[in-house]
Amino acid sequence: LPKAPVITTPLETVDALVEEVATFMCAVESYPQPEISWTRNKILIKLFDTRYSIRENGQLLTILSVEDSDDGIYCCTANNGVGGAVESCGALQVKMKPKITRPPINVKIIEGLKAVLPCTTMGNPKPSVSWIKGDSPLRENSRIAVLESGSLRIHNVQKEDAGQYRCVAKNSLGTAYSKVVKLEVEVFARILRAPESHNVTFGSFVTLHCTATGIPVPTITWIENGNAVSSGSIQESVKDRVIDSRLQLFITKPGLYTCIATNKHGEKFSTAKAAATISIAEWSKPQKDNKGYCAQYRGEVCNAVLAKDALVFLNTSYADPEEAQELLVHTAWNELKVVSPVCRPAAEALLCNHIFQECSPGVVPTPIPICREYCLAVKELFCAKEWLVMEEKTHRGLYRSEMHLLSVPECSKLPSMHWDPTACARLPHLDYNKENLKTFPPMTSSKPSVDIPNLPSSSSSSFSVSPTYSMT
């Protein structure tokens, strides 16, 4: 007698490992024999799909090599035309041993930056990821964390973070280890011992000593008055990532000697500089045909503005040049009672660099004036209102004594950088922060279409002097 189909063994949840065989059984009783079809996630499985084997008149469905993507709900439907079609469903849960899909790679990182070592995993159940440094499990702390993705994040990388790392992915089915990778921590060049200035007699021998460190170990070069050292002997030694350089000189003229420590980080370099002046005892008394002499700035007003150990021109038309020029800057400042925060650092730098001009040492020491373009930028962009006040007071003779003549440079009389870039001095960059920029003079547009990063604002609201290191 005809009999409607009945599924005698309903489908069950099947657990299967990747690359293994998984079988669903759908036993059916009926007469006549039913047609049995299979679906995965409600999509019909085609009889000719070579990834599957359908046997026993359709009652057995075998997945020949389980893949991660085979997860889902499998249903069999039986129909023989007698009564309605019947259906039974079961789930396939693909289990997978841990697998590291994106292993960590060797990393070189600069001290203080953030390092991320990737370790992306697959597996079911989801593997837990831990890390090993050297031979020991890595402990997480406020700086070191294993992210949800399995990657290792190290904030503010320190020298001691350098070493060999590997990640471990673990679930109930097994454990996977990544290959060992190296984290190398690089450190900017830094000067540990700066050369000292000397005041010596003509024909003396002087040894300048400079010590620097960094990872990789920096190289040290010596510069004499802006050029590579042409004479003198250099001795170097390296021990425990510290380089020690000694420059021995036979002194026949005064000069500014700069020790430059440089190391390379990928395509970029970091540099640290320290300078010392060599002055000759009798040279400090200017010769009659000189209008001044070079000396290290020792005042206070321009301390934050002029580069450390800067050689400045002291004008001998004053009885006491240092005191007179210092008073000159002081006086100019006292006359500017209200100065905007945008103008102040620019005006400070301009006045200091104008009154204490950079000095080019030599038989006839020469002052190096500020480049006209930098003067104009201060005058018209940063200090437009204040400049008018200064010029007005200068013309009306409101400055005490006659020292005001030097206070405000006449930009048009200064040399242009286009004529000879070495004949004039640039003003260093302003340390601007966004707060200052809100009050910037509306020279051009009411809606500035510019992106200015947050630069560190200088504590003395002045121009920044060369940092200990710079990236070039």
Epitope: E373, Y374, E380, L381, M417, H418, T444, P448, D451
Partner: antibody, heavy 124, light 107 residues
Framework: EVQLVESGGGLVQPGGSLRLSCAAS????????IHWVRQAPGKGLEWVAS????????SYADSVKGRFTISADTSKNTAYLQMNSLRAEDTAVYYC?????????????????WGQGTLVTVSS | DIQMTQSPSSLSASVGDRVTITCRAS??????VAWYQQKPGKAPKLLIY???SLYSGVPSRFSGSRSGTDFTLTISSLQPEDFATYYC?????????FGQGTKVEIK
């Protein structure tokens, strides 16, 4: 000798993208300001964008804001102009030019060196 | 935004003539104004920067001056090679504006 060489121009459909390069030699991009200026056929000069690498600051003309991005790779001594959502009115010869100094001072030096220009045509 | 209105848009002159081109800024600006010469198919060339400074290698017959918001380029004695288009350009801290250009043609 200072030289600027532009590349990357060509024909692109409206809505498309192009990236122009400006390779500099004889000076360092990091100590200068780099500008892109364009000139539509038979028209005058129009400033497009500027970058001052020492500050990392950038600025754009209103007509390209939000569509164009100026950048510089100081290690390659090259500046770039990424142009997205291109329109027919962006058709022009694009010049890159440099000026001395940083953002605040560069204006006083003028654009002293220019490239030969690269033609960008936006047409369907 | 600041507009730089350049006049005249074109002029005809003879060799030896004195030529004056003016740019007027729509509001108070700095002296960061430059003048350029451009010949067909070529990139512009810098002539004057900072309103009145002559760029190196530029003949002394070219000069620039400023009076308030008016900027002037003067060619004291026009030469055959001076027939070209001239542009003024103003630089602010945030943006740059060019004048529309003045075409100097042979009369």
């Amino acid at each position: 000798e200072v030289q600027l060489v532009e590349s990357g121009g060509g024909l692109v459909q409206p809505g498309g993208s192009l990236r122009l390069s400006c390779a500099a030699s004889g000076f360092t991009v990091s100590s200068s300001s780099i500008h892109w200026v364009r000139q539509a056929p038979g028209k005058g000069l129009e400033w497009v964008a500027s970058i001052s690498s020492s500050y990392g600051s950038t600025s754009y003309a209103d007509s390209v804001k939000g569509r164009f991005t100026i950048s510089a790779d100081t290690s390659k001594n090259t500046a770039y102009l990424q142009m997205n959502s291109l329109r027919a009115e962006d058709t022009a010869v694009y010049y890159c030019a440099r000026s001395e100094g940083d953002r605040y001072v560069s204006g006083y030096f003028g654009l002293d060196y220019w490239g030969q220009g690269t033609l960008v045509t936006v047409s369907s | 935004d600041i507009q730089m209105t350049q006049s005249p848009s074109s002029l005809s002159a003879s060799v030896g003539d004195r030529v004056t081109i003016t740019c007027r800024a729509s509001q108070s600006v700095s002296s960061a104004v430059a003048w350029y010469q451009q010949k067909p198919g070529k990139a512009p060339k810098l002539l004057i920067y900072s309103a009145s400074s002559l760029y190196s290698g530029v003949p002394s017959r070219f000069s620039g001056s400023r009076s308030g918001t008016d900027f002037t380029l003067t060619i004291s004695s026009l030469q055959p090679e001076d027939f070209a288009t001239y542009y003024c350009q103003q630089s602010g801290v945030w943006l740059i504006t060019f004048g529309q250009g003045t075409k100097v043609e042979i009369k």
